[in-house]
């Protein structure tokens, strides 16, 4: 009874299509598959960024796989052929591993790359990224930002750079169509006549870095003798109401009364007849139903009621004050 053997896939390689971290892993079928013509061969692929403790594992019948990587580090991958038990009289057969690596040859020392990269997607409309120049780089150093996400034919360069002393220190992005809920890849590279500049790579999802506009149209409504309803509206823009969480800060007679987090555009407050002044502010953030993370908006303008008996069952007058 001869032992069944199978060869590893051929020509296993990692291909960089220029998408700033989104790479193709591809291979060819193993040699000598003639004995297994009736069989559907599978491949077990393992890959990771060098330095990561865990491998990602994929089992596929295809001859390629695509995923995102951190190009600040190297990438290692290995693959072997699997013959399912149906082909081998009851036991799965695996080939030896074929292995490959990929890395971008780093230019320049790490200190020359951009520092403190910060990106915010304002109101789910306007993406702005800013950075500081590398440590010890000269004023002749300039940085260029490129970005890519699935849907673009190729990586694009920043349209509107923000400058300081002639150096690019940020980017205002153009309209980004169908760019959320997918990985967004950025590379900031640099050039200098004096020394090579290290490139930096960043990956995030836009919906997770949204900073909304603050809520607007804050009002008070008397609900009962001991309850006041605070109401506000979502700001103008593309973020639907279902995506907001709110934090309210309420001050009663100059002392902090309540800080609360709510999901709706209303909050009912218990009051006493002694209350002479009531002020509140609200801020918003994209909630867990629409993103994994987010940034609180600025606080709204402060809305106050003062000078009348709060126990009156009326729609209360309100004045604008700045928080």
């Amino acid at each position: 009874d001869t032992e069944i053997k199978v060869n590893p896939p051929q020509d296993f390689e990692i291909v960089d299509p220029g998408y700033l971290g989104y790479l193709y892993l591809q291979w060819q079928p193993p040699l000598s598959l003639d004995h297994f013509k009736e069989c559907t061969v599978e491949y077990e692929l393992k890959y990771r960024n060098i330095g990561s403790e865990t491998w990602k594992t994929i089992i596929t019948k295809n001859l390629h796989y695509k995923d995102g990587f951190d190009l600040n580090k190297g990438i290692e991958a290995k693959i072997h052929t699997l013959l399912p038990w149906q082909c081998t009289n009851g036991s799965e057969v695996q080939s030896s591993w074929a292995e490959t690596t990929y890395w971008i040859s780093p230019q320049g020392i790490p200190e020359t790359k951009v520092q403190d990269m910060d990106c915010v997607y304002y109101n789910w409309q306007y993406l702005l990224c800013s950075w500081k120049p590398g440590i010890g780089v000269l004023l002749d150093t300039n940085y260029n930002l490129f970005y890519w996400y699935e849907g673009l034919d190729h990586a694009l360069q920043c349209v509107d750079y923000i400058k300081a002393d002639g150096q690019n220190i940020g980017c205002r992005f153009p309209y980004l169509e169908a760019s959320d809920y997918k990985d967004f890849y950025i590379c900031v590279n640099g050039s200098s006549e004096n020394k090579p500049i290290r490139s930096s790579y960043f990956t995030f999802q836009l919906q997770n870095i949204v900073k909304p506009l603050p809520p607007v149209y804050l009002t008070f409504t008397r609900e009962s003798s001991c309850e006041i309803k605070l109401k506000w509206s979502i700001p103008l823009g593309p973020i639907p109401a279902r995506c907001f969480d709110y934090e309210i800060e309420i001050r009663e007679d100059d002392t902090t009364l309540v800080t609360a987090t709510v999901e709706n555009e209303t909050y009912t407050l218990k009051t006493t007849n002694e209350t002479r002044q009531l002020c509140f502010v609200v801020r918003s953030k994209v909630n867990i139903y629409c993103s994994d993370d987010g940034i609180w908006s600025e606080w709204s303008d402060k809305q106050c009621w003062e000078g009348e008996d709060l126990s009156k069952k009326t729609l209360l007058r309100h004045h604008h004050h700045h928080h």
Partner: antibody, heavy 119, light 111 residues
Framework: QVQLVQSGAEVKKPGASVKVSCKAS????????MNWVRQAPGQGLEWMGR????????DYNQNFKDRVTITRDTSASTAYMELSSLRSEDTAVYYC????????????WGQGTSVTVSS | EIVLTQSPATLSLSPGERATLSCRAS??????????MNWYQQKPGQAPRLLIY???RQGSGIPDRFSGSGSGTDFTLTISRLEPEDFAVYFC?????????FGGGTKLEIK
């Protein structure tokens, strides 16, 4: 909520200078470019220049041949446009106008400041 | 500088009709895969209002009857069904390169 409030109308003599202010509120001033556009009576629109409040970077329309100076005070969320060596053809309404970047156009405009140059 | 030519200078139509306004640039206003062409509406005594940016993107709060199209040097603003409040002057503007320039305007008047 976004508001651009400009200073009041001005009447100036030829050769004088005028400085128009534009106070921004309802948004983060430094995140958006501030443009200046003018419109002579019954005429079209003419872009004068823009400032990036984030870093102070400025682009001018060279047609104004060094007569225009655009500045900003980020702490006051205010942009300024000064036009010198005024002549009668500078009589126009001057607008400040906010735009996020070159691909977004100009989405909010001030109410306009009328400048009349007359001897 | 890039010169923008709008046509017609005046367009006389009735409410409910379709309006097609044209803007031609002296050179391409495309770059980075974007058409840097914007459209504005202006009514007497008022500041302009952004209708369309990047050739075809609707400005905030702009009704769906306004649409933009085109690339390179030829651009069109279409108002699918004219409302009484749409009769105004319309300007195209390029933001590809400094100095930003405006077209001479098309006056849309009631027939």
């Amino acid at each position: 909520q976004v508001q651009l409030v400009q200073s009041g109308a001005e009447v100036k003599k030829p050769g004088a200078s005028v400085k128009v202010s534009c106070k921004a509120s309802g948004y983060t001033f430094s995140n958006y470019l501030m443009n200046w556009v003018r419109q002579a009576p019954g005429q079209g629109l003419e872009w004068m220049g823009r400032i990036d409040p984030y870093d102070g970077d400025i682009d001018y329309n060279q047609n104004f041949k060094d007569r225009v100076t655009i500045t900003r005070d980020t702490s006051a969320s205010t942009a300024y446009m000064e036009l010198s060596s005024l002549r009668s053809e500078d009589t126009a309404v001057y607008y400040c106008a906010r735009g996020y970047g070159t691909a977004y156009g100009v989405d909010y405009w001030g109410q306009g400041t009328s400048v009349t140059v007359s001897s | 500088e890039i010169v923008l030519t709008q046509s017609p200078a005046t367009l006389s139509l009735s409410p409910g009709e379709r309006a097609t306004l044209s803007c031609r640039a002296s050179e391409s206003v495309d770059n980075y895969g974007i058409s840097f062409m914007n459209w504005y509406q202006q009514k007497p005594g008022q500041a302009p209002r952004l209708l369309i940016y990047a050739a075809s993107r609707q400005g905030s709060g702009i009704p769906d009857r306004f649409s933009g199209s085109g690339s390179g040097t030829d651009f069109t603003l279409t108002i699918s069904r004219l409302e009484p409040e749409d009769f105004a002057v319309y300007f195209c503007q390029q933001s590809k390169e400094v100095p930003w320039t405006f077209g001479g305007g098309t006056k849309l008047e009631i027939k």
